[in-house]
């Protein structure tokens, strides 16, 4: 007996061939011997089965001795043994129809769980193997669970259902709702304009919700909400913004915030959250601001940074075109009685300069 696997909602073709390549009488019946379709004269006739409105045959192939039965919009309950009667012989085909669906919406927030459920005919014992767009392999039986979705899980999941050494492949599109980056750091000299960008890792036809940026300044004892905004069909409008700093926000996606100037009192870290309409939970992106200031006061040249810096970052003061350098893995460096000339303050990570500020020291007569 031949086994054919089908997918719920799809179309399947069960083949039946006569030895003689000519038009001849044939019938398709189910396991209960109820006629589904057949030929009478030159016409296709249908029996009283439940499949009658979804079953068909390729008339163009009859004269080649091919008497297939096509079943459209497959249902799990179509799983059965079908019998083709042609030329006084019977050919049996076992059809097994499977369905694989996501238990919830296929648009899920990062960190949420995804459950795929297999619908299968009674008596079958299939196995399922799924591969994520990022190459993650997951195996299971009737259900497959991905406990915590990551950004890279967004895309088409390919799942293979196996039964009796036959396979059928399902493709499920999963959209993980997240920001492109979990965290980002902006390095600025004091007084420079600061641009924060929060690009999304997905696109939706209709994007509505609300967002808020909470900020913990390094110098402040508590965090506060810097801005609250509305997102309606990808249009952004500010609901509430602090007086200091007076942030500005772009009206279109990607979410974009501008801080007029970087000041030491603003250095710190923020958390932008976005709540999407009809979704439980929020999207998060952390953003950090590091501010550098180079100053000369009397005989002291100082370079300072504020904000979240890692201990391995190096802060240096260096006289241009000269070897004079002072470096520290600290948030402030200074030189007493500096030589005249252009001094550079550099914040670097393993030799890579993250932030640079120049200050001119004039000779004192």
């Amino acid at each position: 007996k031949k086994v054919v696997l089908g997918k719920k909602g799809d179309t399947v073709e069960l083949t039946c061939n006569a030895s003689q390549k000519k038009n001849t009488q044939f019938h398709w019946k189910n396991s209960n011997q109820i006629k589904i379709l057949g030929i009478q004269g030159l016409f296709l006739t249908k029996g009283p089965s439940k499949l009658s409105d979804r079953a068909d045959s390729r008339k163009s192939l009859w004269d080649q001795g091919c008497f297939s039965m096509i079943i459209k919009n497959l249902k799990i309950e179509d799983s059965d043994t079908y019998i083709c009667e042609v030329e006084n012989k019977k050919e049996e085909v076992e059809l097994l129809v499977f369905g694989l669906t996501a238990n919830s919406d296929t648009h899920l927030l990062e960190g949420q769980s995804l459950t795929l459920t297999l619908e299968s005919p009674p008596g079958s014992s299939p196995s399922v193997k799924c591969r994520s767009p990022g190459g993650k392999n997951i195996q299971g039986g009737r259900t497959i669970s991905v406990p915590q979705l990551e950004r890279q899980d967004s895309g088409t999941w390919t799942c293979t259902v196996s039964q009796d050494q036959k396979t059928v492949e399902f493709k499920i599109d999963i959209v993980v709702l997240a920001f492109q980056k979990a965290s980002s750091t902006v390095y600025k000299k004091e007084g420079e304009q600061v641009e924060f960008s929060f690009p999304l890792a997905f696109t939706l036809e209709k994007l509505t919700g609300s967002g808020e940026l909470w900020w913990q300044a390094e110098r402040a004892s508590s965090s506060k909400s810097w801005i609250t905004f509305d997102l309606k069909n990808k249009e952004v409008s500010v609901k509430r913004v602090t007086q200091d700093p007076k942030l500005q926000m772009g009206k279109k996606l990607p979410l974009h915030l501008t801080l007029p100037q970087a000041l030491p009192q603003y250095a710190g870290s923020g958390n932008l959250t976005l709540a999407l309409e009809a979704k439980t939970g929020k999207l998060h992106q952390e953003v950090n601001l590091v501010v550098m200031r180079a100053t000369q006061f009397q005989e002291n040249l100082t370079c300072e940074v504020w904000g979240p810096t890692s201990p391995k970052l190096t802060l240096s003061l260096k006289l241009e075109n000269k070897g004079a350098t002072v470096s520290k893995q600290a948030k402030a460096v200074w030189v007493l009685n500096p030589e005249a000339g252009m001094w550079q303050c550099l914040l670097s990570d393993s030799g890579q300069v993250l932030l640079e500020s120049n200050i001119k020291v004039v000779p004192t007569w």
């Epitope: 967002g211 506060k224 609250t228 309606k232 509430r240």
Partner: antibody, heavy 119, light 107 residues
Amino acid sequence: EVQLVESGGGLVQPGGSLRLSCAASGFTFSSYWMSWVRQAPGKGLEWVANINQDGNEKYYVDSVKGRFTISRDNAKNSLFLQMNSLRAEDTAVYYCAREGGQWLALDYWGQGALVTVSS
Amino acid sequence: DIQMTQSPSSVSASVGDRVTITCRASQGISSWLAWYQQKPGKAPKFLISGASSLQSGVPSRFSGSGSGTDFTLTISSLQPEDFATYYCQQANSFPWTFGQGTKVEIK
């Protein structure tokens, strides 16, 4: 545990003044906008005023503009409502409430202070 | 000012009933709507923000829906402790305004 406790309510004659206080605890008071909401006896809720974290941005309902002043003292975790030129229609239970979450809802409320304006 | 209109003003229901309260804004407020529950002599209690986001600790029998001008609060299976007055409130623009309230009474 977030707690808001109002005080300063009482009986006052029309045209008189009263100052309500709200003592906050269990959260970082200086991080949140705060509101006053009132409820006349047997009536619904009416939002009165709110103030931002730093105390430099304030909004009022038209019926109290020029008569009521909202203020705060972050060092003392306290919110205030100075009510002048009081009228009989200002009689109500006054609630202090915290504004929390990005949808600007009033997520925690005090138990209320009754203000009665009557001669 | 944005007017908020709740209906019905009161509803009589039994334990286990499904109760639906509607709130209509005089102009579009996107999802800037909150729902509160108030029992006699007590302060209001926050239930839902953003039209549909349930406050943590609020039973899942409460749900909110809607956007723009029309909003709904649904109690899927009324419990004895749910008999109270419910208010909607818009936070779209100042002054913030509340609906007149819907009293859920025991039938």
